[in-house]
Interface confidence: medium
């Protein structure tokens, strides 16, 4: 229904706290360099204006669209061109072009320092002094570093953060209470960020149809007892919510997500028997819980999929008359029977089925042609299953750090032109798949591994798009989203690459490495490993292991030495010489 004032409508629906949080996220995601104080000032102005519209919907400017109101605010920021360069040109455009322009200038890898967590005492002091400002800083810092973070979900993580601080700041040992809990939230939020970015990429590159197909597969796996009409309704609503968030319409997105959660809880009988626990929770927790609710028990009496999609004499008629609905039904039926498959795999199977019908329905004897289609799925299913087995075996053998190193070597060989920081970040993220997925029960491994890898590789593609350097990466990133992971897995050593010159300074270390946290130490060592591979792309695993073991021993020895500086300056050059010899 149309409202006289859109901003008043959203303020009323969301309430002041969520309204302010979402406006802050929106501004922080658009203008990623502005300080918290600058954004907080704008948020207060927008909120005050929204209140005047709630009081009188026909007050001046209350009838303007949210894009117009927010865009005008952003464009009024002083020194916009000095700070943001050509983004300021967006302000010469009219809506909706202006908003599109802002979206195009979102930076997936902003040059901001890493978000450092203050030490426990300081954190608790500022949290107690002003919890609202403290949470505002959290929203601002996360949103500007992750410009596509799913806004209503970021409010959920802020709420988690708040609860942890409330609990831990009352304890004697604040540090040991806070650290593991906040690390847990951070890890979950980072995964949430790459997953959502993948959804926005799907929407931006391939449109709503592609996202809806993803949603149909995912929802059918989770709710196998819901019928196709119900799944279609949920997928349509979910597509709308994600389209809004990816498009920067955060107030509408959060409002519609709350509506969808309400609908699901009011219609549990036709959706799933597993929703009640989620539905008993308050809004943000409820929506989060529903988004990762366990799969419902599969109906016992599902007929074989072949009956409708291979054996039925009307297959080609069904397909010809309404392709999308017929393929959607296939995807629904196949997905509800396979919670053990990844969404990417299910979409590849649907694509294979579609290609088979396209070919066979044009032939003289279609049933004879498409009769073997289900058997032809076998290699498509085996490939990711083998990937999971091989990688989980390797993870179990090497542990997370060793597994990350193995992946780093593999990916540096595949795309040695990619910058070392990007390769290290990608390998560390890809390597976490072991800890995240390999410990799960067998039937949950494949969906966990492949869908997580796809999301990480999407980030690799986004970073590479900014500065394309590798033809291998360009090739894999140009194809469809669901083919990316198999494409990257199939890449071998890039034979066109001219090895890097050996530079001693790349492998020269100083005593300051000794005081770094373990994570930073690992990154330094992994940076050296990537550089070694770039120098000798065809080095054997044995050679690389020898060098890295030597390197680890060197660090250990010098960091324990009484005179660390002397140890580094004398032993360092020896290490470099030994490295060169080992790789010769």
């Amino acid at each position: 229904e149309a409202h006289k004032s859109e901003i008043a409508h959203r303020y009323n629906d969301l309430g002041e706290q969520h309204f302010k949080g979402l406006v802050l996220i929106a501004f922080s995601q658009y203008l990623q360099k502005c300080s918290y104080d600058e954004h907080a000032k704008l948020v207060q102005e927008v909120t005050d204006f929204a209140k005047t519209c709630v009081a009188d919907e026909s007050a001046a400017n209350c009838d303007k669209s949210l894009h117009t109101l927010f865009g005008d605010k952003l464009c009024a920021i002083p020194n916009l061109r000095e700070n943001y360069g050509e983004l300021a040109d967006c302000c010469t455009k009219q809506e909706p072009e202006r908003n599109e322009c802002f979206l195009q200038h979102k930076d997936d890898n902003p040059s901001l320092p890493p978000f450092e967590r203050p030490e426990a005492e300081a954190m608790c002091t500022s949290f107690k002094e002003n919890p609202t400002t403290f949470m505002g800083h959290y929203l601002h810092e996360v949103a500007r570093r992750h410009p596509y973070f799913y806004a209503p979900e970021l409010l959920y993580y802020a709420e988690q953060y708040n609860e942890i601080l409330t609990q831990c700041c009352a304890e004697a040992d604040k540090e040991s209470c806070l650290t593991p809990k906040l690390d847990g939230v951070k890890e979950k939020a980072l995964v949430s960020s790459v997953r959502q970015r993948m959804k926005c990429s799907s929407m931006q590159k391939f449109g709503e149809r592609a996202f809806k197909a993803w949603a149909v597969a995912r929802l059918s796996q989770t709710f196998p007892n819901a019928d196709f009409a119900e799944i279609t309704k949920l997928a349509t609503d979910l597509t709308k919510v994600n389209k809004e968030c990816c498009h920067g319409d955060l107030l509408e997105c959060a409002d519609d997500r709350a509506e969808l959660a309400k609908y699901m809880c009011e219609n549990q009988a036709t959706i799933s028997s597993k929703l009640q626990t989620c539905c008993d929770k308050p809004l943000l927790k409820k929506a989060h819980c529903l988004s990762e609710v366990e799969h419902d028990t599969m109906p016992a009496d599902l007929p074989a999929i072949a009956a409708d999609f291979v054996e039925d004499q009307e297959v080609c008629k069904n397909y010809a008359e309404a392709k999308d609905v017929f393929l959607g039904t296939f995807l629904y039926e196949y997905s509800r029977r396979h919670p053990d498959y990844s969404v990417s795999l299910l979409l590849r199977l649907a694509k294979k089925y579609e290609a088979t019908l396209e070919k066979c329905c044009a032939e003289a004897n279609p049933p004879a042609c498409y009769g073997t289609v289900l058997a032809e799925f076998q290699p498509l299913v085996e490939e990711p299953k083998n990937l999971v087995k091989t990688n989980c075996d390797l993870y179990e053998k090497l542990g997370e750090y060793g597994f990350q190193n193995a992946i780093l070597v593999r990916y540096t060989q595949k795309a040695p032109q990619v910058s070392t920081p990007t390769l290290v970040e990608a390998a560390r993220n890809l390597g976490r798949v072991g800890t995240k997925c390999c410990t799960l029960p067998e039937d949950q491994r494949l969906p966990c591994v492949e869908d997580y890898l796809s999301a990480i590789l999407n980030r690799v593609c986004l970073l590479h798009e900014k500065t394309p350097v590798s033809e291998h990466v360009t090739k894999c990133c140009s194809g469809s989203l669901v083919e990316r992971r198999p494409c990257f897995s199939a890449l071998t050593v890039d034979e066109t690459y001219v090895p890097k010159e050996f530079k001693a300074e790349t492998f020269t270390f100083h005593s300051d490495i000794c005081t770094l946290p373990e994570k930073e130490k690992q990154i330094k060592k992994q940076t050296a490993l990537a550089e070694l591979v770039k120098h000798k792309p065809k080095a054997t695993a044995e050679q690389l292991k020898t060098v890295m073991d030597d390197f680890a021993q060197f660090l250990d020895t010098c960091c324990k030495a009484a005179d660390k500086d002397t140890c580094f300056s004398t032993e360092g050059p020896n290490l470099v010489t030994r490295c060169k010899d080992a790789l010769a």
């Epitope: 019928d227 009956a307 039925d312 039904t329």
Partner: nanobody
Framework: EVQLLESGGGLVQPGGSLRLSCAAS????????VAWFRQAPGKGREFVAG????????YYADSVKGRFTISRDNSKNTLYLQMNSLRPEDTAVYYC???????????????????WGQGTLVTVSS
Amino acid sequence: EVQLLESGGGLVQPGGSLRLSCAASGRYIDETAVAWFRQAPGKGREFVAGIGGGVDITYYADSVKGRFTISRDNSKNTLYLQMNSLRPEDTAVYYCAARPGRPLITSKVADLYPYWGQGTLVTVSS
């Protein structure tokens, strides 16, 4: 759950017409693939006509093509079968069957339909 109730059967002379109705409850009929089957004395159930859910794609057995028309009225949640040029071999009990949540796919295989009405008798005789 879907409940189906057929009506409109009766005695009719060869060449005559009848219109069967099937009222559905518990589910919107446009979200459901629905079909008419018939069973002549001493024979198995035979597919007559079907209509997809969500999209109005119709299907007919070769024996009734051009004579029978399947349709539905979503506002009344009712399925119809208009039968013209009736023949003695059309004599049978006519059943309405539904497959919820499978738009389009109105299989000719009776076993794939979980919901059935109680049937209405059509007799074609002079």
